[in-house]
Interface confidence: medium
């Protein structure tokens, strides 16, 4: 694919932020704020947690999630998986794009009850028009939202 | 805002690096090297720790800080906050853009009291001409500088 | 250097993924998949673990490595170093560009000896035609490969 950046076209970009409604507990992807505060969509659209591509090309996609807790919830595996996944009409299952595994629960010190950790992912992937990218965190109970600055999801065409 | 990338214009970008003077202990933002080694400014300017925008648009801004220590300094909260903040003439206080909280002091192993950790932030934000972006780390006593490769701050227009 | 983004030119970009052959144990840089799955090269070339620049300019370069283990291997220092390094014909040694140090082995919880951690690096550097960028991890024994989504290496011109 020869991809050109036309000088008269707007370069697709988006930055979506964490909100109280981000964590559904349903096993689905995280949901995001698309308009308020720092959030915006430019040349990309949004649907049920997904960034939807309107113009095919190579995109740098990224996500950060803020993790935190008091010890580890009962039954929680010691590993948190944070990933960016692609949905495409050409394939029935989500495809892993960028994934991290972390073991943050061991981070509390002897004197500190609370632990915090952060996971950042970013990389370039090719996306066709109509394809979607979502963020998943397993176990999402440890994701800490606050004001849209600590957990977020974005992309821009390169 | 419809933002176009003109083919005859230089795309603003910068990468600033950590230096011995970065940590002031004054409660202000981190200071950065702008010219030596890997550091550069192209279509952005610098003032007292801040990247200053000369051309409005959407920018991918990023920062990494290298953290490290031996145990935790007495009285240090168990959480380190690393953030990118915007200063704008239209508002008296700094605005949080991208923030991470980490509990790195719990990372010392049983055989080693020395620990290292790294915090990376990156995301797309809209910046107007004249607005500034700074990096803050609380508590900055745990930031470890060396040669400009471990702690840095940059941006480029998308 | 005045760098222009011509509208008729392809913008150089690449994303290389971890594979079974990535870890050589030879003391050299990590090796990468360049064609299969999510991996691609566009306006950049590849040679023995290195992204090779064909067009001079400023590039956002990035790498993530997935780390993991059961306790810490005997004799392993408590610090893992993950870095992006430049090779240039003008200088005999590799030059550090972006580096992180982490102490992940302390992350095992009391209930689990298994730990996971991830290291992400990204930043803008100037690269001349013919210069190369490689990824190194010391000690690479703790890098965990799987399917190309957890450890990767990429770049794009800004």
């Amino acid at each position: 694919l020869i991809q050109e950046r036309r000088s008269h076209e707007v370069n697709p970009a988006a930055h979506l932020t964490g909100a109280n409604s981000s964590l559904t507990g349903s096993g689905g992807p995280l949901l995001w704020e698309t308009q308020l505060g720092l959030a915006f969509l430019r040349g990309l659209s949004y649907h049920d947690g997904a960034l939807v591509v309107t113009k095919a090309g190579y995109y740098y996609i990224y996500s950060k999630v803020q993790l935190g807790g008091v010890g580890c919830p009962l039954g929680l595996a010691s590993t948190i998986t944070h990933g960016l996944y692609k949905r495409t009409p050409r394939y029935p299952e989500e495809l892993e794009l960028l994934v991290s595994q972390q073991s943050p629960c061991g981070r509390a010190t002897s004197s500190s009850r609370v632990w915090w950790d952060s996971s950042f992912l970013g990389g370039v992937v090719h996306l066709e028009a109509g394809e979607e990218v979502v963020v998943r965190v397993l176990d999402e109970r440890l994701v800490r939202l606050r004001d849209g600055t600590r957990s977020y999801f974005g992309a821009f065409m390169v | 805002l419809i933002q176009e990338r003109r083919s005859h214009e230089v795309n603003p970008a910068a990468h600033l690096t950590g230096a011995n003077s970065s940590l002031t202990g004054s409660g202000g933002p981190l200071l950065w090297e702008t010219q030596l080694g890997l550091a550069f400014l192209r279509g952005l300017s610098y003032h007292d720790g801040a990247l200053v925008v000369t051309k409005a648009g959407y920018y991918y801004i990023y920062s990494k800080v290298q953290l490290g220590g031996v145990g935790c300094p007495l009285g240090l909260a168990s959480t380190i906050t690393h953030g990118l903040y915007k200063r704008t003439p239209r508002y008296p206080e700094e605005l949080e853009l991208l923030v991470s909280q980490q509990s790195p002091c719990g990372r010392a192993t049983s055989s080693s009291r020395v620990w290292w950790d790294s915090s990376f932030l990156g995301g797309v934000v809209h910046l107007e001409a004249g607005e500034e972006v700074v990096v803050r780390v609380l508590d900055e006593r745990l930031v470890r500088l060396r040669d400009g490769t471990r702690s840095y701050f940059g941006a480029f227009m998308v | 250097l005045i760098q222009e983004r011509r509208s008729h030119e392809v913008n150089p970009a690449a994303h290389l993924t971890g594979a079974n052959s990535s870890l050589t144990g030879s003391g050299g840089p990590l090796l990468w998949e360049t064609q299969l799955g999510l991996a691609f090269l566009r306006g950049l070339s590849y040679h023995d673990g290195a992204l090779v620049v064909t067009k001079a300019g400023y590039y956002y370069i990035y790498s993530k490595v997935q780390l993991g283990g059961v306790g810490c291997p005997l004799g392993l220092a408590s610090t893992i170093t993950h870095g992006l390094y430049k090779r240039t014909p003008r200088y005999p040694e590799e030059l550090e560009l972006l580096v992180s140090q982490q102490s992940p082995c302390g992350r095992a919880t009391s209930s689990s000896r298994v730990w996971w951690d991830s290291s992400f690096l990204g930043g803008v550097v100037h690269l001349e035609a013919g210069e190369e960028v490689v990824v190194r991890v010391l000690d690479e024994r703790l890098v965990r490969l799987r399917d190309g989504t957890r450890s990767y290496f990429g770049a794009f011109m800004v």
Partner: antibody, heavy 122, light 107 residues
Framework: QVQLQQWGAGLLKPSETLSLTCAVY????????WHWIRQPPGKGLEWIGE???????NYNPSLKSRVTISVDTSKNQFSLKLSSVTAADTAVYYC????????????????WGQGTTVTVSS | AIQLTQSPSSLSASVGDRVTITCRAS??????FAWYQQKPGKAPKLLIY???SLESGVPSRFSGSGSGTDFTLTISSLQPEDFATYYC?????????FGGGTKVEIK
């Protein structure tokens, strides 16, 4: 609606062991941190200890040598034992649930027992 | 242990007044912080958790702010049922600690 019902001996002699039990009704036991807090007459609140959602116990160092918190998940109950009591242990004792709100912290105690007045007197 | 210094220890106010209670921690505790209201003979009641989040069912005239070492509880317009003792609490470090309390009385 979650309720905490607590019971135990209200009058003790010095050197005896205080024993209180708290039952959780109308809600889940797992996934929360459970605490004991006390309040001496006319004074402020003092944290005694907790049993966390992962099953670990943590105690106030000032009481650590004398306190034990245990749990019986099959009965949705947790208990407090405080040995070698003195008059200084006279207080109202509360069992408490720590909130667990997805996306924020756990940082608040949202459900309290009715309190048990314990008097230590010879 | 982290000390929480609450001020004032008592205050007199009238219905409709704006009341502010502060709590200062001896070291940083981020947002691991809560405020409670206690009336005589009753268990404390959670008002604010995570430093600034309003507990369900608590009137919106109560608000919390602050992060790090300095925290504030504000009652925007004091109501007759608000006369009580208020406590702050930190959750960041062991042992968990409470402030000494602020008694809000009728002027």
């Amino acid at each position: 609606q979650v309720q905490l019902q607590q019971w135990g001996a209200g009058l003790l002699k010095p050197s005896e062991t205080l024993s209180l039990t708290c039952a959780v009704y109308g809600g889940s036991f797992s996934g929360y941190n459970w605490h004991w807090i006390r309040q001496p007459p006319g004074k402020g609140l003092e944290w005694i200890g907790e049993i966390t959602h992962s099953g670990s116990t943590n105690y106030n160092p000032s009481l650590k040598s004398r306190v034990t918190i245990s749990v019986d998940t099959s009965k949705n109950q947790f208990s407090l034992k405080l040995s070698s009591v003195t008059a200084a242990d006279t207080a109202v004792y509360y069992c408490v649930r720590e909130i667990a709100v997805a996306g924020t912290g756990y940082y608040g105690m949202d459900v309290w027992g009715q309190g048990t007045t314990v008097t230590v007197s010879s | 242990a982290i000390q929480l210094t609450q001020s004032p220890s008592s205050l007199s106010a009238s219905v409709g007044d704006r009341v502010t209670i502060t709590c200062r921690a001896s070291q940083g505790i981020n947002s691991a912080f809560a405020w409670y209201q206690q009336k005589p003979g009753k268990a404390p009641k959670l008002l604010i958790y995570d430093a600034s989040s309003l507990e369900s069912g608590v009137p919106s005239r109560f608000s919390g702010s602050g992060s790090g070492t300095d925290f504030t509880l504000t009652i925007s317009s004091l109501q007759p049922e608000d006369f009580a003792t208020y406590y702050c609490q930190q959750f960041n470090s062991y042992p968990l600690t409470f402030g000494g309390g602020t008694k809000v009385e009728i002027k």
